[in-house]
Amino acid sequence: MDSFNYTTPDYGHYDDKDTLDLNTPVDKTSNTLRVPDILALVIFAVVFLVGVLGNALVVWVTAFEAKRTINAIWFLNLAVADFLSCLALPILFTSIVQHHHWPFGGAACSILPSLILLNMYASILLLATISADRFLLVFKPIWCQNFRGAGLAWIACAVAWGLALLLTIPSFLYRVVREEYFPPKVLCGVDYSHDKRRERAVAIVRLVLGFLWPLLTLTICYTFILLRTWSRRATRSTKTLKVVVAVVASFFIFWLPYQVTGIMMSFLEPSSPTFLLLKKLDSLCVSFAYINCCINPIIYVVAGQGFQGRLRKSLPSLLRNVLTEESVVRESKSFTRSTVDTMAQKTQAV
């Protein structure tokens, strides 16, 4: 989130009475964590365990298939984006445990908290690419038969990653460490100094490109896809609808608190009560957004179980079925054999 957003423990409200208990030594630190911070820690721990193991498994399953299966390319890239973000979690976890003290230096401050934003943009752009792929399979099957290949898929992914990196640069550039004199603490956050307009611009761009525009375009895209599949009475279209809704909805649900608080904070004075309240919730909003980094493997497994009846196969085998099934370009079948790859859309959910 923007502006110096990491809160300290409660040091009491400094009132203006010049009182000092001369016999009581004063602690310079507080041992109690706020409830939102405790919740954030729990979420971070779960996301780290599920995200690292789940996405590593997805990468392992899809990496072997990526040469020949386009769906595997999509899922591989989404899993890599999620996996990378999860690697920052131990550091973020440690910082919250230490009341947001940041002993890791300036470079780590610029890079690690920016990973979740890189993940957000990479995921949403990859999901947009996947959605375009789904759209073309349904509406331009002949074009797909002629041009849809692994090479083009990799180029599309590279473009998505490149754009994601570009969109993450503002957050990266404005992240700084600030050392507070008392209580003694080093903080990592975003500082726009006097430039409130720039802060608002970054927050608005993030909201529009990372949330509102994808929400609009993907809603329209899947409305068309689902209308077409229903009109053709494609088999398992209800199942497709469920997966699509799960995938797309999870992205927007988990990013919503972060985006709303981010845009609000950019328009508020840093000393205002509302700003300070939102700042206390910041870690929780970030952790909630981080759920996107571990939800994809869960959706794949749940969907896989659904399609297999019940879990009779090993996890890698089940995931392989879900993630590496190639789409048949004949329109009527495009949702029959590859229903599950629409789950890819989900991973846009970072």
Epitope: D15, L22, N23, Y181, F182, L187, D191
Partner: antibody, heavy 123, light 112 residues
Framework: QVQLQQSGPELVKPGASVKISCKAS????????MNWVKQRPGKGLEWIGR????????KYNGKFKGKATLTADKSSSTAYMQLSSLTSEDSAVYFC????????????????WGQGTTLTVSS | DVLMTQTPLSLPVSLGDQASISCRSS???????????LEWYLQKPGQSPKLLIY???NRFSGVPDRFSGSGSGTDFTLKISRVEAEDLGVYYC?????????FGGGTKLEIK
């Protein structure tokens, strides 16, 4: 009544070292931080660093790292600042300043200043 | 480091007039706990500085109520409602929010 009594003026040669003292009274010495501030004519005020007499923890302005060394003696309620490798740039008035924070973090300010120690570096 | 810029450098006033000194920080000095540690000091010739205002607007004990502080974020002001002879000297703003704490360049309040 809080008082900070600093040592007298010093005249030293370039390259030498000097140790300035600041004796505190009227409050519990280990319950407040002691800061040091430099004032040169026409150059304003500069924060050098601070020491927590309770645990000896120090924090320096990057500009004065290697130049100033802060210490404190709880038994005599005295803070010290040693300045080394002196040059004419170090000629200034040096103040010790109490940083106050009350129990439960009530209040927060640099409230009491010593009378200042004039350091002249000259050959 | 946070640069504290004071204006004006010199402020000639008549006794009984209102005086206003401005201080601007190069970055926000609002701490993560919401507090802003901005102080004002008066230094008379041959003396050490004396604390007047702390935390932007709170008068230190014994400071007359003609002194008042205001501001937020990066812009702060010290006002003296009716200047008296004992108010003459150099006024410094100071931020104690971030390391290293820094002082403004000073404003000399003098008789016209």
């Amino acid at each position: 009544q809080v008082q900070l009594q600093q040592s007298g003026p010093e005249l030293v040669k370039p390259g030498a070292s000097v140790k300035i003292s600041c004796k505190a009274s009227g409050y519990v010495f280990s319950n407040s931080w002691m800061n040091w501030v430099k004032q040169r004519p026409g150059k304003g005020l500069e924060w050098i660093g601070r020491i927590d007499p309770g645990d000896g923890d120090t924090k320096y302005n990057g500009k004065f790292k290697g130049k100033a060394t802060l210490t404190a003696d709880k038994s005599s309620s005295t803070a010290y600042m040693q300045l080394s490798s002196l040059t004419s740039e170090d000629s200034a008035v040096y103040f010790c300043v109490r940083f106050y924070y009350g129990s439960n973090y009530v209040g927060y300010y640099f409230d009491y200043w010593g009378q200042g120690t004039t350091l002249t570096v000259s050959s | 480091d946070v640069l504290m810029t004071q204006t004006p450098l010199s402020l000639p006033v008549s006794l009984g007039d209102q005086a206003s000194i401005s201080c601007r920080s190069s970055q926000s000095i609002v701490q993560s706990n919401g507090n802003t540690y901005l102080e004002w000091y008066l230094q008379k010739p041959g003396q050490s500085p004396k604390l007047l205002i702390y935390k932007v607007s709170n008068r230190f004990s014994g400071v007359p109520d003609r002194f008042s502080g205001s501001g937020s974020g990066t812009d702060f002001t010290l006002k003296i409602s009716r200047v008296e002879a004992e108010d003459l000297g150099v006024y410094y703003c100071f931020q104690g929010s971030l390391v290293p704490p820094t002082f403004g360049g000073g404003t000399k309040l003098e008789i016209k």
